[in-house]
Interface confidence: low
């Protein structure tokens, strides 16, 4: 079941998945001046069995001006490229993604790939948030969001992360309430059905990650 919406946006924060649940799709997008080859896949799909998951299909881009296809990097589940920015606010252990059954790693780049990756997440997917460079986490609760099924519809849980500029003074001494309390949202969020998630990956986020932002182009 695909998630209807994108994960919530948090001011001055980015999110990424540490691993992608089977069923996740990644659009084959090409950068300006390039396009998918005519017979090329529209998307990559995370598929697998009980012991191994990998990305099906491969994305290929060709110059809009020529008919020659560019070299293609075939996604390998062993490879991993993290796209995230800034240091974590608190040290945590990195996730061994090979130990997460039913999940695919971050696909490696393909030549002339677009600057932004567009994923289509499935129910049960978890994404993690951290503040962008120049901002720090204030009074952080769960800096993650999970796509859950509720009354036949999907929703993302609200990440309880507030990012403030380094020079700003904290308005959260002690246990004061965060601005627009992320938990006191007006919409109804009572669930009829949820899928359980892997708690291990909820709490074991990488302590250091490469400083290329989640949606930023590859060098």
């Amino acid at each position: 079941e695909l998630c209807d919406d994108d994960p919530p946006e948090i001011p001055h924060a980015t999110f990424k998945a540490m691993a992608y649940k089977e069923g996740t799709m990644l659009n084959c997008e090409c950068k300006r001046g390039f396009r998918r080859i005519k017979s090329g896949s529209l998307y990559m799909l995370c598929t697998g069995n009980s012991s191994h998951s990998s990305w099906d299909n491969q994305c290929q881009c060709t110059s809009s001006a020529t008919r020659n296809t560019t070299k293609q990097v075939t996604p390998q589940p062993e490879e991993q490229k993290e796209r995230k920015t800034t240091e974590m606010q608190s040290p945590m252990q990195p996730v061994d993604q090979a130990s997460l059954p039913g999940h695919c790693r971050e696909p490696p780049p393909w030549e002339n790939e677009a600057t932004e990756r567009i994923y289509h997440f499935v129910v049960g997917q978890m994404v993690y948030y951290q503040c962008v460079q120049g901002y720090r986490a204030l009074h952080r609760g769960p800096a993650e969001s999970v796509c859950k099924m509720t009354h036949g519809k999907t929703r993302w849980t609200q990440p309880q992360l507030i990012c403030t500029g380094e020079m700003e003074t904290s308005q959260f001494p002690g246990e004061e309430k965060p601005q627009a309390s992320p938990e006191g949202r007006p919409e109804s969020e009572t669930s009829c059905l949820v899928t359980t998630t892997d708690f291990q990956i909820q709490t074991e986020m990488a302590a250091t990650m490469e400083t290329s932002i989640f949606t930023t182009e590859y060098q």
Epitope: P142, T157, E176, E183, S188, Q202
Partner: nanobody, 127 residues
Framework: EVQLVESGGGLVQAGGSLRLSCAAS????????MGWFRRAPGKEREFVAA????????LYAGSVKGRFTISRDNGRNMVYLQMNSLKPEDTAVYYC????????????????????WGQGTQVTVSS
Amino acid sequence: EVQLVESGGGLVQAGGSLRLSCAASGGTFRTRNMGWFRRAPGKEREFVAAVSWNVDNKLYAGSVKGRFTISRDNGRNMVYLQMNSLKPEDTAVYYCAADNIPLSSDMRPTATEYDYWGQGTQVTVSS
């Protein structure tokens, strides 16, 4: 693996008090929203109370409001349910639950929203 262990249940007379405790381990406790549910004999599991990760939001079922108080101690990885003025209809198995769902002030969570559960502790209120 998250583990929740309840304690503090027992037999008490109507009008008495009990304090239930829930010890959490195996995960980052301070980032969880915690709740108490109960199941009376022959009935569905029902929501009792919940507390948000930073204790800025507490919710109670109408039947326990004013009598029960939920609290948590992030330093000790504990959640508590103080139950006063107990009634025979409070007799049930009480379960501690955890998840990172947001708490909405106008809706009570249902049991299916919580992914992590304890084994429960029996509370019996005699008349």
